[in-house]
Interface confidence: low
């Protein structure tokens, strides 16, 4: 069937359109184009005779039409009036007629639109604004954009007048945005320039910064006020209701307590006519005095007295702080703070509580410190120590003993020999001693402030013959590869040589053996089981010598990796299984067995009579030395075969 296609269907003014013919019949005489929906000679545009290839214009020909041999019609420089139907009349060779109709529509190219507004300065929460998209254009669609986004859904936004008018009811500051309108028709779309809505608002309740309301005398007060407002607000300051100045910032240097009061910022918007105020209460504090510490006891006695330290002066609504040894207070049941933190009580003072102590008064963001205070704690005397530590002396030498006891105030000393007072000095000196000077030497220390006394007694032996020495040890049961042992030869004697023997031999050279303290002390580092020997010490001087009884070192070791015997791992069914486990250990270890991971008996020997293949599996021996805290184990696989199935198997025990 003959059809006409318009390309394009919607045509912009000034452009061109092609009326394209489809299914044109064969053997044509000619064809003719008409404006309208029927063949009307008065509205003929152009005719064409194929034989002569002659095109003949008709009454409706405008000079803008071109006809092609395939009967298609091109119309150029389209005008609005070209809109409508076009009919093709085809005359075939047999003079039979055929017709087809097509159509297109013409639209203008739209101009760039613009936005008009009925209110250039609307007031927030009061005014409405109507934007209108200009010009009014027929057959055009109107669209709106806010900040380049399509219109949000809002009950305050309303479109009217064919969407040409956008109304914003009760405008808010959030409506301050870029607005654009767009016109569209089938052949063009144009957007306006943006219009910025200038919403007048505020002032909101102003905010005063900084938020700080507390100041010290002598500081500068610098307050700033800000209120959201369009146009920007005009500011005024009032102090205690009295007008000060019309500025956004209020500056008062070197304030005093008299500057305390209520500070009001008033914000005014000349366009909206609105005022808003905010009040802040400023408190100016006088510089507090430097604090100092008072004590209820200037000379407390250790372990007897309590001391209460008080931070002066007393100021209401003040935070008091304490430091000991330049640190904040440690957590201690002996330290107690009063409810207001002003008094620090030390219960049952010790010599370590001397301090220094400081207290502080917190004033806003700074703290004023007192001078440090040191406690004079009376203590002691402790048990006095007598030096040197020698107890044996040879006749003819000088005896010089010194006594010392920790004490505050320093102790007063007295010496007694065999209970008889000798002298009130810290040192005792006797020249050219004899055997008669042997005896009990007592040092007595006395603290006059606390009234306490302590004594120490030392036995001094004056003899040409040295006593039989003995060995003391710092560890009677050392653990192998872990502990060290220090043997000391007693007593300590003046002008004496100390000697050592191990198993009757002189000391071997070893980096693990070390002599110290004038050879009086023998230290064995990282002891081993081989160190379990007899140790003897000897002392000698120019006139005598003596040896100690031997001391045998008991080294704890093991358990070593155990050995299971016999070594056989294959048995015949019906044999007895008798496994024995042994591990080197001191003291002897505890033994236990597991078969296939299941605990068995706690014995050194595991016996199973008449074993079968069911007794196949892993046999583990576990050893444990409670003294060393160490454990060890070994696993052995046992295979039991049916009788006679495998030559060379053990028959068992």
């Amino acid at each position: 069937k003959l059809t006409i296609e318009s390309t394009p269907f919607n045509v912009a003014e000034g452009k061109e359109v092609l009326l394209l013919v489809h299914n044109l019949p064969q053997h044509l005489f000619g064809y003719s184009w008409y404006k309208g929906e029927r063949v009307d000679g008065n509205r003929q545009i152009i005719g064409y005779v194929i034989g002569t290839q002659q095109a003949t214009p008709g009454p409706a020909y405008s000079g803008r039409e071109i006809i092609y041999p395939n009967a298609s019609l091109l119309i150029q420089n389209i005008i609005q009036n070209d809109t409508g139907f076009y009919t093709l009349h085809v005359i075939k060779s047999d003079l039979v007629n055929e017709e087809a109709t097509g159509q297109f529509r013409v639209y203008p190219e739209l101009p760039k639109p613009s936005i008009s507004s009925n209110n250039s300065k609307p007031v927030e929460d009061k005014d409405a604004v109507a934007f209108t998209c200009e010009p009014e254009t027929q057959d055009a669609t109107y669209l709106w954009w806010v900040n380049n986004q399509s219109l949000p859904v809002s009950p305050r936004l309303q479109l009217s007048n064919g969407n040409r008018t956008l109304t914003l009811f009760n405008v808010t500051r959030n409506d301050t945005a870029s607005y654009k309108c767009e016109t569209q028709n089938p052949v063009s779309a144009r957007r306006s320039d943006s219009v910025i809505l200038n919403v007048l608002y505020g002032p909101d309740a102003p905010t005063i910064s900084p938020l700080n309301t507390s100041y010290r005398s002598g500081e500068n007060l610098n307050l700033s006020c800000h209120a959201a407002s369009n146009p920007p607000a005009q500011y005024s300051w009032f102090v205690n209701g009295t007008f000060q100045q019309s500025t956004q910032e209020l500056f008062i240097p070197n304030i005093t307590v008299n500057n305390s009061g209520s500070y009001t910022c008033q914000a005014h918007n000349s366009d909206t006519g609105l005022n808003r105020t905010t009040v802040t209460t400023i408190t100016v504090y006088a510089e507090p005095p430097k604090p100092f510490i008072t004590s209820n006891n200037s000379n407390p006695v250790e372990d007897e007295d309590a001391v209460a330290l008080t931070c002066e002066p007393e100021i209401q609504n003040t935070t008091y702080l304490w430091w000991v040894n330049n640190q904040s207070l440690p957590v201690s049941p002996r330290l107690q703070l009063s409810n207001d933190n002003r008094t620090l009580t030390l219960l049952s003072v010790t010599r370590n509580d001397v301090g220094p102590y400081e207290c502080g008064i917190q004033n806003e963001l700074s703290v004023d410190h007192s001078d440090p205070v040191i406690l004079n704690v009376l203590y002691g005397p402790d048990d006095p120590t007598i030096s040197p530590s020698y107890t044996y002396y040879r006749p003819g030498v000088n005896l010089s003993l010194s006594c010392h006891a920790a004490s505050n105030p320093p102790a007063q000393y007295s010496w007694l020999i065999d209970g008889n007072i000798q002298q009130h000095t810290q040192e005792l000196f006797i020249s050219n001693i004899t055997e008669k000077n042997s005896g009990l030497y007592t040092c007595q220390a006395n603290n006059s402030a606390s009234g306490h006394s302590r004594t120490t007694v030392k036995t001094i032996t004056v003899s040409a013959e040295l006593p039989k020495p003995s060995i003391s040890s710092n560890n009677s049961k050392p653990v192998e590869d872990k502990d060290a042992v220090a043997f000391t030869c007693e007593p300590e004697a003046q002008n004496t040589t100390y000697l050592w023997w191990v198993n009757g031999q002189s000391l071997p050279v070893s980096p693990r053996l070390q002599l110290s303290n004038g050879n009086r002390t023998l230290t064995l580092f990282n002891v081993t089981r081989n160190d379990a020997r007899a140790y003897v010490c000897g002392i000698q001087n120019s006139v005598s010598a003596n040896r100690s009884d031997p001391v045998t070192l008991d080294v704890l070791y093991g358990p070593d990796t155990p050995i299971i015997s016999p070594p056989d791992s294959s048995y015949l069914s019906g044999a007895n299984l008798n496994l024995s486990c042994h591990s080197a250990s001191n003291p002897s270890p505890q033994y236990s067995w597991r078969i296939n991971g299941i605990p068995q008996q706690h014995t050194q020997v595991l016996f199973i009579a008449k074993i079968t293949p069911n007794n196949n599996g892993t046999y583990a021996c576990f050893v444990s030395n409670l003294a060393t805290g160490r454990n060890n184990s070994i696993v052995k696989s046992i295979t039991v075969s049916a009788s006679g199935t495998s030559p060379g198997l053990s028959a068992g025990a």
């Epitope: 910064s209 900084p210 938020l211 700080n212 309301t213 609504n317 207001d340 917190q362 963001l365």
Partner: antibody, heavy 121, light 108 residues
Framework: QVQLVQSGGGLVQPGGSLRLSCAAS????????MSWVRQAPGKCLEWVSA????????FYADSVKGRFTFSRDNSKNTLYLQMNSLRAEDTAVYYC??????????????WGQGTLVTVSS | DIQLTQSPATLSVSPGERATLSCRAS???????LAWYQQKPGQAPRLLIY???SRATGIPDRFSGSGSGTDFTLTISRLEPEDFAVYYC?????????FGCGTKVEIK
Amino acid sequence: QVQLVQSGGGLVQPGGSLRLSCAASGFTFTSYAMSWVRQAPGKCLEWVSAISGTGDSTFYADSVKGRFTFSRDNSKNTLYLQMNSLRAEDTAVYYCAKDLGWLQYGLFDYWGQGTLVTVSS
Amino acid sequence: DIQLTQSPATLSVSPGERATLSCRASQSVSSSYLAWYQQKPGQAPRLLIYGASSRATGIPDRFSGSGSGTDFTLTISRLEPEDFAVYYCQQYNNWPLTFGCGTKVEIK
């Protein structure tokens, strides 16, 4: 020593109400402004409200204004946050916090242990 | 409102190294009114620095603060194992009080 012990958190439906308490000890209560700060799970810290030492001035974040009321009972050394018209976005751990200095607002040297408020249907 | 932007969001550092954390304000903050806090999981925040550079009571001197205007910095000179946490900056110059969203300092 300063202690802030909180109570009153829990699960509440949207639109419901809840009251948080914060008992203070170890300092002169009336000398210090106090605040509530909250932290939604895995989120930032958000200041909620502040109250002056005497209780005559209160401040609120916009997100809670008109729904939350911050008060204090200085005779009991206790703070209260009354939360009404609760929303899912109010779900958070709420901390009460003590200000560092006299009449200083917004600088927190001691905090409560926090209490979880969950708003869910 | 004053917005505080902290960077980086996460900082991976080895113990003993130096850590530098940044806090930027959307408008000028008086340096007297900027603070830093440390928060560990399941705990309340702990005040480290106030007034941009003053250490709070009991805070070790490896923590230091600096900056003015809109740019502030927290520096941890030598990170100890207990310093791995989230650090927040906060302004207390204007209502509303605002916090940054934190920098997490994690073990590298």
